[in-house]
């Protein structure tokens, strides 16, 4: 058993049917010595008397808010949450597995640049009695500061019969140098509590590996005289690290017909313009990627050919 | 159709072309190592990220773009002295800081070259003959060092009398390649920045 925060305790259980559970001793936070009784949640049934209460915690019915009283007056509370260990591995019931890039990927994180600012998000099908708390650091043995905001509900979507809720959090490394070569990963820890169930989720990454630039901006077409060709031009996204000659991007220009089945023409360039053939009803899209370290491509920025 | 990327004119800044080749070569070598050594801890998540140049060179700081020198988090100044007679900038004026930056890059390359050559000698003794260093990568390191053209004492190749532990050597190879790839990215960024200056 360990303290999550004041008066909130987590009981770790090896979780399987008919498991013996854990014996827990609760102590009433009071100078009083006698006349103390204990109750659980809203029930008025007296579970025991005395300054301490010993309970066998096996199932969720044994968790909850234990209160000690004296003469009708509340002396203190202890909220017990359960953390299930299933075959040696902590349970992951609260969050939805995003399964990308591998099974048991619950947290996904992205950074728009090398400033040390990043966003993480996760999914759940649970809509009520749910709280999250996020902590982060650079490295774990001698952690350096990363400040995270509060997790907020960022999207709701319907998936089949289920509603899916997306939560996200923004974090900023306290003293980040965009040009630094990372040797210690960023660690993100999310505590999740649903009713009386506690779970924790972690993700470890280097900022360089979660970079996903914003799409190129100001995408424009300039028809070339007496030709079906057009000059496509664009600019670096505002959110990208500067100077651009140091933090360079590479670009992919795509000409896509109206039908998804039509052949796509693609050109790769380090410049911020390209000459392509603009077909009728086609659209031109451009996306960006770090020129020197191949992390994710940005989303596409698109303009119609007409 | 996939059209090739147009490469910038290497005449503008001879080192830019070499540094791009370096990044390509080390990335290919790292990919090859990860595939060949799939039963060894060779992924970014599994290895310890060690920097053999730590406390010996300060490439990131010495080569910091002017725009980032206002960022206090980037000014982790280290006292390191460098030889300052680089010729990479051809006819351009080589400022003291630029020479410091380029000589730091040269020292990095020299250190990695020695480590890789020592390691290759060990790997050649491995009866499994599982993996060797790509000669192209070693050649590209050499070319960039020649383009940088710094005079510096030759570091003797480390020789070891004891029987090599091939498992440890292969893990060390992975660690070195990961670190060298990150340094190659920095070198490429620096050359691109200097080319634009």
């Amino acid at each position: 058993i360990w303290e999550l925060k004041k008066d909130v305790y987590v009981v770790e259980l090896d979780w399987y049917p008919d498991a013996p559970g854990e014996m827990v001793v609760l102590t009433c936070d009071t100078p009083e010595e006698d006349g103390i009784t204990w109750t659980l949640d809203q029930s008025s049934e007296v579970l025991g008397s005395g300054k301490t209460l010993t309970i066998q915690v096996k199932e969720f019915g044994d968790a909850g808010q234990y209160t000690c009283h004296k003469g009708g007056e509340v002396l203190s509370h202890s909220l017990l949450l359960l953390h299930k260990k299933e075959d040696g591995i902590w349970s992951t019931d609260i969050l939805k597995d995003q399964k990308e890039p591998k099974n048991k990927t619950f947290l996904r994180c992205e950074a728009k640049n090398y400033s040390g600012r990043f966003t993480c998000w996760w999914l759940t099908t649970i809509s009520t009695d749910l709280t999250f708390s996020v902590k982060s650091s650079r490295g774990s043995s001698d952690p350096q500061g990363v400040t995270c905001g509060a997790a907020t509900l960022s999207a709701e979507r319907v998936r089949g019969d289920n509603k899916e809720y997306e939560y996200s959090v923004e974090c900023q490394e306290d003293s980040a140098c965009p040009a630094a070569e990372e040797s210690l990963p960023i660690e993100v820890m999310v505590d999740a509590v649903h009713k009386l169930k506690y779970e924790n989720y972690t993700s470890s990454f280097f900022i360089r590996d979660i970079i996903k630039p914003d799409p190129p901006k100001n995408l424009q077409l300039k028809p070339l005289k007496n030709s079906r060709q057009v000059e496509v031009s664009w600019e670096y996204p505002d959110t990208w690290s500067t100077p651009h000659s140091y933090f360079s991007l590479t670009f992919c220009v795509q000409v896509q017909g109206k039908s998804k089945r039509e052949k796509k023409d693609r050109v790769f360039t380090d410049k911020t313009s390209a000459t392509v053939i603009c077909r009728k009803n086609a659209s031109i899209s451009v996306r960006a990627q770090d020129r020197y370290y191949s992390s994710s491509w940005s989303e596409w920025a698109s303009v119609p050919c007409s | 159709r996939n059209l090739p990327v147009a490469t910038p004119d290497p005449g503008m800044f001879p080192c830019l072309h070499h540094s791009q080749n370096l990044l390509r070569a080390v990335s290919n070598m790292l990919q090859k190592a990860r595939q060949t050594l799939e039963f060894y801890p060779c992924t970014s998540e599994e290895i310890d990220h060690e920097d053999i140049t730590k406390d010996k060179t300060s490439t990131v700081e010495a080569c910091l773009p002017l725009e980032l020198t206002k960022n206090e988090s980037c000014l982790n100044s280290r006292e390191t002295s460098f030889i300052t007679n680089g010729s990479c900038l051809a006819s351009r004026k080589t400022s003291f800081m630029m020479a410091l930056c380029l000589s730091s890059i040269y020292e990095d390359l020299k250190m990695y070259q020695v480590e890789f050559k020592t390691m290759n000698a060990k790997l050649l003794m491995d009866p499994k003959r599982q993996i060797f260093l790509d000669q192209n990568m070693l050649a590209v390191i050499d070319e960039l060092m020649q383009a940088l053209n710094f005079n510096s004492e030759t570091v003797p190749q480390k020789s070891s009398l004891e029987e090599p532990d091939f498992y440890k050597t292969k893990i060390k190879l992975c660690i070195l390649l990961h670190a060298f790839r990150i340094r190659a990215v920095t070198i490429d960024r620096v050359m691109s920045y200097l080319n634009a200056s």
Epitope: D14, Y16, P17, D87, D93, K96, N103, T124, T125 | -
Partner: antibody, heavy 115, light 112 residues
């Protein structure tokens, strides 16, 4: 005590479907993840699928992905395996089992896919 | 295709000690716990060992498990006729968890 009873097995032609059930009793079914495991005649054990407590996370072996669907009805204390596009190589005894360091297995139900 | 390798068969006379090995890799046995099951003909597998070396109540102390690096082993001391069965190791892989990874299985024969 904990009991798991599989049913729904039988002989079926290739390409057809079958739905297996696993009735659970003696424990709080809704609190435990559940697996399906199969064993072809004379062969070893092969994991098929897993479902977490509320059914939001499901996992499948590559050999059955896209053809089999694991589901559960916690109000009925029952685990299901919907098997579509059955093949001869799906012939096996199918077991359901609880997830945990101490697990409980059903007695198994035989599925034979044959023309 | 199982990635946990066991010998197809082992045999011993009554009273002897036999061991069954289970060989994996860093991503499975190297990073997860191991279980051992006994399966008698026509019956469901029965748990013998969990958490590498722990015996559930009711399992005789003749059965013991151990794990070292990327391999695990099950030892049966004082072999008895009723120990003749198939034995399977089981673990997880850190990349595919919660998929159960079973060993190839070992037939233990008690020599008359």
């Amino acid at each position: 005590q904990v009991q798991l009873v599989e049913s729904g097995g039988g002989v079926v032609q290739p390409g057809r479907s079958l739905r297996l059930s696993c009735a659970a009793s003696g424990f709080t079914f809704s609190s435990y993840g559940m697996h399906w495991v199969r064993q072809a005649p004379g062969k070893g054990l092969e994991w098929v699928a897993f479902i977490e407590v509320d059914g939001s996370n499901k996992y499948y072996a590559d050999s059955v992905k896209g053809r089999f669907t694991i589901s559960r009805d916690n109000s009925k204390n029952t685990l299901y395996l919907q098997m579509n596009s059955l093949r001869a190589e799906d012939t096996a005894v199918y077991y359901c089992k609880t997830h945990g360091s101490h697990d409980n297995w059903g007695q198994g139900t035989m599925v034979t896919v044959s023309s | 295709q199982s990635v946990l390798t066991q010998p197809p068969s082992v045999s011993g006379a009554p009273g002897q000690r036999v061991t069954i090995s289970c060989s994996g890799s860093r991503s499975n046995i190297g990073s997860n716990t191991v279980k051992w099951y006994q399966q008698l003909p026509g019956t469901a597998p029965k748990l013998l060992i969990y958490y590498n070396d722990q015996r559930p109540s009711g399992v005789p102390d003749r059965f013991s498990g151990s794990k070292s690096g990327t391999s695990a082993s099950l030892a049966i001391t004082g072999l008895q006729a009723e120990d003749e069965a198939d034995y399977y190791c089981q673990s997880y892989d850190r990349y595919t968890h919660p998929a159960l990874l079973f060993g190839t299985g070992t037939k233990v024969t008690v020599l008359a």
